[in-house]
């Protein structure tokens, strides 16, 4: 009988975002071995890649994925068309944006080919693991004599999205943070004339349409004070 | 297979009101955030509205915000938007989708309001 070990993946919800299902232990042959555990991300809702730690396995093995969606019309068991490989291992599978149905249960398999019992089943919901591309484009615009508008792009449904808007001066230490909604706009009401300002941006899925916990990567910074160009009060949007 | 029926649109003087229903059949209404959009005559689909799977969360279209109330009751399998001092310009059809609103999911036969001055 298989045993189930539910694991916590750092999103969890009223149901398991995260099951994990192994043969059980009854000696340690090598079928009893435990599988590494799968991670999957979705990018931009664009690709998905589900990728495990080939090098914890005790020698080199290509372990094979499948998958499935669980009580869905896409239940029917897939294999992985395109593997990642690490030193010619495979240590991954991409999946492309008509394979990630977001809002059904995502079912992966890993299993070693030459021990067929020696398999792990995960279960994911694939709206907690979308990681959006940072945000593009960042502008701003001089309100009044103190006040700043910092306005960007993303690549992605802005009403999905929340963000992350960091800023500091050349005389801080730290950044000083502010969470913005979808509606992605951030003003800076007091700005002091006399220094230099550095602004960036991070993007996440939350939580419209999914409960992230992962970020995107920063956006470039950009800079707005005492080194910038006087010409024109009204825009800059300098990037480093 | 999917099926979304609209109903309640109609026709009102501007600064009226209607409320619209969306009913839900062939997937798993709860599991998904669902969506309002719209489309006047000669223009394309504009997104309205986007409520998440568990009615937590609610987004809106800059052109509606505070005049217009999206929620959802997932027992029942419906989708709802109520719209409050209706303008001209909100005449269009309305559409309600699965899922936060990319396009990609085919719309319900849509129903019409008309709000006239």
């Known amino acids: 009988l298989n045993t189930t070990i539910l694991t916590p993946n750092g999103n969890e919800d009223t149901t398991a975002d995260f099951f994990l299902t192994t043969m059980p232990t009854d000696s340690l042959s090598v079928s009893t071995l435990p599988l590494p555990e799968v991670q999957c991300f979705v990018f931009n809702v664009e690709y998905m890649n589900c990728t495990w730690n080939s090098s914890s396995e005790p020698q080199p093995t290509n372990l094979t994925l499948h998958y499935w969606y669980k009580n869905s019309d896409n239940d029917k068991v897939q294999k992985c068309s395109h593997y990642l490989f690490s030193e010619e291992i495979t240590s991954g599978c991409q999946l492309q944006k008509k394979e990630i149905h977001l809002y059904q249960t995502f079912v992966v398999q890993l299993q070693d080919p030459r021990e067929p019992r020696r398999q792990a089943t995960q279960m994911l919901k694939l709206q907690n693991l979308v990681i959006p591309w940072a945000p593009e484009n960042l502008t701003l615009h001089k309100l009044s004599e103190s006040q700043l508008e910092l306005n960007w792009n993303n690549r992605f449904l802005n009403h999905c999205l929340e963000h992350l808007v960091q800023y500091r001066t050349d005389w801080d230490h730290s950044w000083t943070e502010q969470s913005v909604d979808y509606r992605h706009k951030f003003s800076l009401p007091s700005v002091d004339g006399q220094k230099r300002y550095t602004f960036r941006v991070r993007s996440r899925f939350n939580p419209l349409c999914g409960s992230a916990q992962h970020w995107s990567e920063w956006s470039h910074p950009i800079h707005w004070g005492s080194n910038t160009s006087k010409e024109n009060p009204f825009l800059f949007a300098l990037e480093a | 297979q999917v099926q979304l029926q609209e109903s309640g649109g109609g026709s009102v003087p501007a600064g009226g009101s209607l409320k619209l229903s969306c009913a839900a059949s062939?997937?798993?209404?709860?599991?998904?955030?669902m969506t309002w959009a719209r489309q006047a005559p000669g223009k394309g689909l504009e997104w309205v509205s986007t409520?998440?799977?568990?009615?937590?969360?609610?987004a809106y279209a800059a052109s509606v915000e505070g005049r217009f109330t999206i929620s959802r009751d997932n027992a029942k399998s419906t989708l709802y938007l109520q719209l409050n001092s209706l303008k001209t310009e909100d005449t269009a059809m309305y559409y309600c989708?699965?899922?936060?609103?990319?396009?990609?999911?085919?719309p319900g036969q849509g129903t019409q309001v008309t709000v006239s001055s």
């Open positions: 409520i998440a799977s568990d009615g937590g969360s609610t």
């Open positions: 062939g997937f798993s209404f709860s599991s998904y955030p």
């Open positions: 989708t699965k899922g936060y609103g990319d396009g990609t999911p085919a």
